[in-house]
C-alpha cells in the first residue's frame, strides 16, 4: 500500500532505535571516510525530521522519497569534493541516477586502519558511560569498512556485542570474558560480510533472476517439505529484501525482512517443522536464527528425479510451455533431495540440465538425446567432492596455519601478479575453510566448503577489478559466479609470469616482529612466503618448506636472544644467503 510519507512509515514500522541504527549504517556505507560525529549529527537531523513527518505526514518534504532525503543530506556535507573527489559529481545528478552513482563509488577496500579493539577496561568504561554512543561507534566502524554489510544483520551483531559487554563488564576478569566472546562475534560477522557481498555481486552482475535461483536452491535444501509455490514465494520475498539492502535501501530492507520473518513464523506448517525455536525469539534474533535454521527432515517418499525430468514424454513440451518455471521446478526438486550439495553445485547442475534441454529439445528425437543427462552430472558432482576430500585431508595434516601457507603457495603460483597483501588476505581467508568446515559431519562438508570458498573468491575478484593485473584472475572472474571456484581450482602455474628479482630488503626483519601478536607474526611470515614464490614460482614444496623452517627457526632464536637487535642484524643476512642458496 502507498504511504503519504515514506520516512514516517519506516520510522513507525522500525521504531526509533532500529531506524537510527539503519540510517547510521546507510550513511557510513555511502561516505566511508566521514567521522562518527559527522554521521551521528546527520542521523539525528534525519530522525528529528522523521518525527516531524510522523506527527504530520503532510508537513513540508515529508512526501519525498528516502533516496531524495538521504541524498540531499549527504550532498549538503561540507568539503565533499575535497574529501571524496569525484563522488561529489553524484550530487549533480537527479534521483534515481544519484543513488546509483553513490552505489558505484562504494569502496570494497577502503584505506582505513584495521578496526582495533580497545583494551577491556577502557572498553567497559566507555560502554557504561554511554552504551548508545558506544554501539553507534561499532555500527559506524563496521559499516564503513564493509559497505555492503547486510544492515539488519549488523544490528543483530551490535545487539550481540551489547549483550557480551553487559555481561562481561560486570565480571572481575573482564579481558578473559570479553576476548573469546568478541572474537566469536567478529569471526561470524566477517563471514556474514563476505557472504552478503557475494549476494550483492550476484544481483549487480547477473540480476534478480540469478539471485532468485540461488534462493530457490538454498530454501529447497532447508525446507524440503515446503511445496514449490511456497519456496517460490519465499525466494521472491528474499530476493526483494536482498535487492533493497544491496541497493542501499536499508530501511525498506529491514522492514521487509521483519515481514518475511513474521510470514515464516505464521506459516510454519507449510514451511518447516524446525522454525518454532527461532520464532520464539525477539525480532533481530528471530530473523538471524531463521537465516541459518537447520534443514528440515527430508520427506521419505520422494520419487526419483528422473521420473519428471527425463522419463516423462512431456519434458520438452513442459520446457517450451514455461522455461523458467520448469527449470525452477527442476532446481527445487533436485535441491530438496540434496542438502549435502553446495548451492553452487546445484546451480551448475541446473545450468547443465538447461543446456541439455536447449540442445536436445531442438532435435528430432529429444528423449534419446536427454536420456543420459543425469549420468552426465556425475563429473560435475565428483569434482567438488574431490576438492573437499583433498583439502580437508591437507588441513588435518597441516593445521590451519600450515594449510593457509599451502594455499598461499598455490594461489601465488596461479596469479603471481596479484599484490602480496591481497594474496595473503585471500589465502588466510581460504585457509579458514578448514577450521570452519572440515570438522563438520561428512554430509555438511561440501556445502560449507564450496559456498564459503565462492564467497571468498568473490572478494578476490572485487579487489582485482579495481586493479586488474592477472589474466588468469580476469578470466575466472569474468565468468558466471557459480563457475568461479572450479575455474580458480583448475588454474595452474602462470607460465607467462617473469619472476621477481630477489630483493634482500623484502626478507630483512627487525626485532619489532618479536612483540607482535601471533596473527601479525603469521602475516609477516606469509608475506615473505608469497614473495619467495614470486621470486621462484616453480620452487618445490620441499624447497619452500626448508626456507620457511629456517625462517621460523631464525625468528625463534633472535626473539629469545638477550640482544635481539644484534641477532637480527647479524643473523638476518645469513638467513637471506641461505634462502637464495636453497632456492637456487
Amino acid at each position: 500500500e502507498a504511504h503519504k510519507s515514506e520516512i514516517a512509515h519506516r520510522y513507525n514500522d522500525l521504531g526509533e532505535q532500529h531506524f537510527k541504527g539503519l540510517v547510521l549504517i546507510a550513511f557510513s556505507q555511502y561516505l566511508q571516510k566521514c567521522s562518527y560525529d559527522e554521521h551521528a549529527k546527520l542521523v539525528q537531523e534525519v530522525t528529528d525530521f522523521a518525527k516531524t513527518c510522523v506527527a504530520d505526514e503532510s508537513a513540508a518534504n515529508c512526501d519525498k522519497s528516502l533516496h531524495t532525503l538521504f541524498g540531499d543530506k549527504l550532498c549538503a556535507i561540507p568539503n565533499l569534493r575535497e574529501n571524496y573527489g569525484e563522488l561529489a559529481d553524484c550530487c549533480t545528478k537527479q534521483e534515481p541516477e544519484r543513488n546509483e552513482c553513490f552505489l558505484q563509488h562504494k569502496d570494497d577496500n577502503p584505506s582505513l586502519p584495521p578496526f582495533e579493539r580497545p583494551e577491556a577496561e577502557a572498553m567497559c568504561t566507555s560502554f557504561k558511560e554511554n552504551p548508545t554512543t558506544f554501539m553507534g561507534h561499532y555500527l559506524h566502524e563496521v559499516a564503513r569498512r564493509h559497505p555492503y554489510f547486510y544492515a539488519p544483520e549488523l544490528l543483530y551483531y551490535a545487539e550481540q556485542y551489547n549483550e557480551i559487554l553487559t555481561q562481561c563488564c560486570a565480571e572481575a576478569d573482564k579481558e578473559s570474558c570479553l576476548t573469546p566472546k568478541l572474537d566469536g562475534v567478529k569471526e561470524k560477522a566477517l563471514v556474514s560480510s563476505v557472504r552478503q557481498r557475494m549476494k550483492c555481486s550476484s544481483m549487480q552482475k547477473f540480476g534478480e533472476r540469478a539471485f532468485k535461483a540461488w534462493a530457490v536452491a538454498r530454501l529447497s535444501q532447508t525446507f524440503p517439505n515446503a511445496d514449490f509455490a511456497e519456496i517460490t514465494k519465499l525466494a521472491t520475498d528474499l530476493t526483494k529484501v536482498n535487492k533493497e539492502c544491496c541497493h542501499g535501501d536499508l530501511l525498506e530492507c529491514a522492514d521487509d525482512r521483519a515481514e518475511l520473518a513474521k510470514y515464516m513464523c505464521e506459516n510454519q506448517a507449510t514451511i518447516s517443522s524446525k522454525l518454532q525455536t527461532c520464532c520464539d525469539k525477539p525480532l533481530l534474533k528471530k530473523a538471524h536464527c531463521l537465516s541459518e535454521v537447520e534443514h528440515d527432515t527430508m520427506p521419505a517418499d520422494l520419487p526419483a528425479i528422473a521420473a519428471d525430468f527425463v522419463e516423462d514424454q512431456e519434458v520438452c513440451k513442459n520446457y517450451a510451455e514455461a522455461k523458467d518455471v520448469f527449470l525452477g521446478t527442476f532446481l527445487y526438486e533436485y535441491s530438496r533431495r540434496h542438502p549435502d550439495y553446495s548451492v553452487s553445485l546445484l546451480l551448475r547442475l541446473a545450468k547443465k540440465y538447461e543446456a541439455t534441454l536447449e540442445k536436445c529439445c531442438a532435435e528430432a528425437n529429444p528423449p534419446a538425446c536427454y536420456g543420459t543427462v543425469l549420468a552426465e552430472f556425475q563429473p560435475l558432482v565428483e569434482e567438488p567432492k574431490n576438492l573437499v576430500k583433498t583439502n580437508c585431508d591437507l588441513y588435518e595434516k597441516l593445521g590451519e596455519y600450515g594449510f593457509q601457507n599451502a594455499i598461499l603457495v598455490r594461489y601465488t603460483q596461479k596469479a603471481p601478479q596479484v599484490s602480496t597483501p591481497t594474496l595473503v588476505e585471500a589465502a588466510r581467508n581460504l585457509g579458514r575453510v578448514g577450521t570452519k568446515c572440515c570438522t563438520l559431519p561428512e554430509d555438511q562438508r561440501l556445502p560449507c566448503v564450496e559456498d564459503y570458498l565462492s564467497a571468498i573468491l568473490n572478494r578476490v575478484c572485487l579487489l582485482h577489478e579495481k586493479t586488474p593485473v592477472s589474466e588468469h584472475v580476469t578470466k575466472c572472474c569474468s565468468g558466471s559466479l557459480v563457475e568461479r571456484r572450479p575455474c580458480f581450482s583448475a588454474l595452474t602455474v602462470d607460465e607467462t609470469y617473469v619472476p621477481k628479482e630477489f630483493k634482500a630488503e623484502t626478507f630483512t626483519f627487525h626485532s619489532d616482529i618479536c612483540t607482535l601478536p601471533e596473527k601479525e607474526k603469521q602475516i609477516k611470515k606469509q608475506t615473505a612466503l608469497a614473495e619467495l614464490v614470486k621470486h621462484k614460482p616453480k620452487a618445490t614444496a620441499e624447497q619452500l618448506k626448508t626456507v620457511m623452517d629456517d625462517f621460523a627457526q631464525f625468528l625463534d632464536t633472535c626473539c629469545k636472544a638477550a640482544d635481539k637487535d644484534t641477532c637480527f642484524s647479524t643473523e638476518g643476512p645469513n638467513l637471506v644467503t641461505r634462502c637464495k642458496d636453497a632456492l637456487a
Epitope: V315, C316, K317, N365, P366
Partner: nanobody, 115 residues
Framework: EVQLLESGGGLVQPGGSLRLSCAAS????????MSWVRQAPGKGPEWVSS????????AYADSVKGRFTISRDNSKNTLYLQMNSLRPEDTAVYYC????????SSQGTLVTVSS
C-alpha cells in the same frame, strides 16, 4: 501459453494426398523439435514423424516411410505433414506435439481415407 492448432484434414480416397499444417504459438518454435502423432479410433497414440528445430533432421515410422514428408517453416511458426499414397489404415486424428511427446495437447485434425 503454448498453443498448437492443426488443420488440413478431411475425407480422401485411397491413393490420394493431403497436406496437414500445425500453427504454433506461445514458445520459441525454432528451438524445439516437433512431431506428428496419430490416434486411430479405439487405439493408443502412434508416433508418425519428427523433425529437428532447424529442419535438418527428420525421422519416420516404418509404416509411413516413403509416403509422408515432414517439414517446417520457422519464419511462419508452422509445421507440415505432406501425406501421399494414403491408405485406409492411415485413418486417424493427427496432432502435432513438441519434442517427441505422445500426449495430446490439442484438438488435432481428422483424416479419413475411404472409398
Amino acid at each position: 501459453e503454448v498453443q498448437l492448432l492443426e488443420s488440413g484434414g478431411g475425407l480422401v480416397q485411397p491413393g490420394g494426398s493431403l497436406r496437414l499444417s500445425c500453427a504454433a504459438s506461445g514458445f520459441t518454435f525454432r528451438s524445439f523439435g516437433m512431431s506428428w502423432v496419430r490416434q486411430a479410433p479405439g487405439k493408443g497414440p502412434e508416433w508418425v514423424s519428427s523433425i529437428s528445430g532447424s529442419g535438418s533432421d527428420t525421422a519416420y515410422a516404418d509404416s509411413v516411410k516413403g509416403r509422408f514428408t515432414i517439414s517446417r517453416d520457422n519464419s511462419k511458426n508452422t509445421l507440415y505433414l505432406q501425406m501421399n499414397s494414403l491408405r485406409p489404415e492411415d485413418t486417424a486424428v493427427y496432432y502435432c506435439t513438441i519434442g517427441g511427446s505422445l500426449s495430446r495437447s490439442s484438438q488435432g485434425t481428422l483424416v479419413t481415407v475411404s472409398s
